[in-house]
């Protein structure tokens, strides 16, 4: 079953590569499991960046190794995507998915556009 | 193959406790949020309890706060739920979950006196 997920349309990542951005989704039920998974699409090829399974009320379960960290409050993920570069720039989909109980929701947003620029380097004093 | 056990259900008097245990294996324990649900007869299957990977967060279902905790141990693959001030409204059968995967076979509690 579909389901709406919300997120803005353009974020611009801070000076040490790092973007945040907000993923909302309309439950369409009382969901206690939700998985939340982050794609990145650029030159028409989708990739996985993270992904995390958590119950209402609780953390993010990302994997250790994950450049993603977040936290859920209700219907809203708040997402941190980090060590980004210029070339990490693109559309960022936020996939959501309803696991348990039944019925299954799934729901994909329209994406945030990442803007990342690497920092110039800091030039030589004398 | 993946194995979740659940032990230490039984009969308690109303007033009582009991402490379950699921041991897990055949997968990352430590990478799985877990979570206990439980069924009673002619009712659907409900969120006791959840506890993060860590166990740094903790969250539980309206009807057993300040009476249930959960708890982990990632050294022992094994994740508990301690059951305090029982209430007949308790009885049921208890599932552990490593989120949103695998499920044990159950463990029934019976609280009567």
């Known amino acids: 079953k579909a389901m709406h997920v919300a997120q803005p349309a353009v974020v611009l990542a801070n000076s040490r590569g790092t973007a945040s951005f907000v993923c909302e989704y309309a439950s369409p039920g009382k969901a206690t499991e939700v998985r939340v998974t982050v794609l990145r699409q650029a030159d028409s090829q989708v990739t996985e960046v993270c992904a995390a399974t958590y119950m209402m009320g609780n953390e993010l379960t990302f994997l250790d190794d994950s450049i993603c960290t977040g936290t859920s409050s209700g219907n809203q993920v708040n997402l941190t995507i980090q060590g980004l570069r210029a070339m990490d720039t693109g559309l960022y989909i936020c996939k959501v998915e309803l696991m348990y109980p039944p019925p299954y929701y799934m729901g994909i947003g329209n994406g945030t556009q990442i803007y990342v620029i690497d920092p110039e380097p800091c030039p030589d004093s004398d | 193959q993946v194995q979740l056990v659940e032990s230490g259900g039984g009969l308690v008097q109303p007033g009582g406790s009991l402490t379950l245990s699921c041991a897990a294996s055949?997968?990352?324990?430590?990478?799985?949020?877990m979570a206990w649900y439980r069924q009673a007869p002619g009712k659907e299957r409900e969120v006791v309890a959840g506890?993060?990977?860590?166990?740094?967060?903790?969250n539980y279902g309206d009807s057993v706060k300040g009476r249930f905790t959960i708890s982990r141990d990632n050294a022992k693959n094994t994740v508990y739920l301690q059951m305090n001030s029982l209430k007949p409204e308790d009885t049921a059968v208890y599932y552990c979950?490593?989120?949103?995967?695998?499920w044990g076979q159950g463990t029934q509690v019976t609280v009567s006196s």
């Open positions: 979950r490593a989120v949103s995967d695998y």
């Open positions: 055949g997968f990352t324990f430590s990478s799985y949020t």
């Open positions: 506890i993060s990977r860590s166990g740094g967060t903790t």
